[in-house]
Interface confidence: low
């Protein structure tokens, strides 16, 4: 699997999409896990509803949500109030029994809040160095990570 990079801004929401073959993965629950080290295990963060027919219902674990369009074949993960510590490698998984197939490997990069450094004199907002919250997916950026490419540092 190639790794797909999703870039989000600190404090905003980042939406990660994982497309899959809806027929091949029919009836399977999905999960989002965080890779612990390069060759370590993938630690489950959140999974879709226990009843596959209700996979469209959004399920939350802390600031991470998952929902599955089983007909269209798209798993969507939302990382709300993105923080620098959210940067790292993740996987979208399709579950069957005790096994898990990788649908997509994802590298999450966290960029600086574009308004976190303003020097605005008396226009300075109290706590302006605090970041945005939850700006949505229209501007989450996705690209393929080329073989051997080094992603830029996830935080500034």
């Amino acid at each position: 699997h190639n790794t797909t990079v999703f870039q989000g801004v600190a404090g905003q929401s980042l939406q990660v999409s994982c497309p899959y073959d809806s027929m091949k993965h029919w009836g399977r629950r999905k999960a989002w896990c965080r890779q612990l080290g390069e060759k370590g295990p993938c630690q489950r963060v959140v999974s879709t509803h226990n009843l596959w027919l209700l996979s469209f219902l959004r399920r939350w674990n802390g600031s991470t949500a998952i929902t599955d369009d089983t007909l269209g074949g798209t798993l969507t993960i939302t990382l709300r109030n993105l923080q620098p510590h959210d940067a790292g490698l993740y996987q979208c998984q399709s579950l069957h029994g005790s096994e898990a197939d990788t649908l997509r490997k994802v590298l999450v990069e966290v960029l600086a809040d574009p308004l976190d450094h303003r020097d605005a004199g008396d226009l300075w907002f109290p706590g302006e160095s605090e970041s945005f919250e939850d700006a949505h997916v229209e501007h989450s950026i996705s690209r393929s990570l080329l073989e051997g490419e080094i992603p830029f540092p996830p935080t500034s």
């Epitope: 574009p114 605005a120 300075w124 907002f125 945005f132 939850d134 700006a135 500034s156």
Partner: antibody
Framework: EVQLVESGGGLVQPGGSLRLSCAAS????????MSWVRQAPGKGLEWVSV??????????GYNPSVKGRFTISRDNSKNTLYLQMNSLRAEDTAVYYC?????????WGQGTLVTVSS | DIVMTQTPLSLPVTPGEPASISCQSS???????????LNWYLQKPGQSPQLLIY???TRASGVPDRFSGSGSGTDFTLKISRVEAEDVGVYYC?????????FGQGTKVEIK
Amino acid sequence: EVQLVESGGGLVQPGGSLRLSCAASGFTFTDFYMSWVRQAPGKGLEWVSVIRNKANGYTAGYNPSVKGRFTISRDNSKNTLYLQMNSLRAEDTAVYYCARLTYGFDYWGQGTLVTVSS
Amino acid sequence: DIVMTQTPLSLPVTPGEPASISCQSSKSLLHSNGKTYLNWYLQKPGQSPQLLIYWMSTRASGVPDRFSGSGSGTDFTLKISRVEAEDVGVYYCQQFLEYPFTFGQGTKVEIK
């Protein structure tokens, strides 16, 4: 689909007041910074004001050219942004756009024309 | 305030040919975090402006890859690799580094 629809523009005499509204839909309104940008007839763009999101207390900032005369506010229960304009001057004549602010002004309304003239 | 100066103010173009617009800021827009806070917008005739480029060189969602942004701390360029008829309108650069946010005067791009 993100939509921003401005209203409230019109003809007003110098020294008068006007309140513009911007109805927002298609996104979680409370999560976003919102802004007003204006454009005088045949001229360029001028940033007017910004109001921050829920996480940052809905605090506001203004261009010095309007500070003390204009007030930006939002009614989050109605998903609506406002611009209260007082002590209007001829040079405030412009199309006023409301815009969502993320990496830049990423969504804009169609604008509402404010004419200040006696 | 940071002053943004665009050149040229008018640019006649030929469809299929490249085009280039320059923008200069009175202060460096390069922040210590490595990002350059310069945006480009296009206002098509009779329409509202639309965001084309942010952080100097990142295309906004849905913007064709014929548009590209480049530059240094104070000198910036928007390039259209092959102009199409739908690209006509007024292009604005805008600094996003400091309040008040300021725009260039605009460059009117029209078909020859």
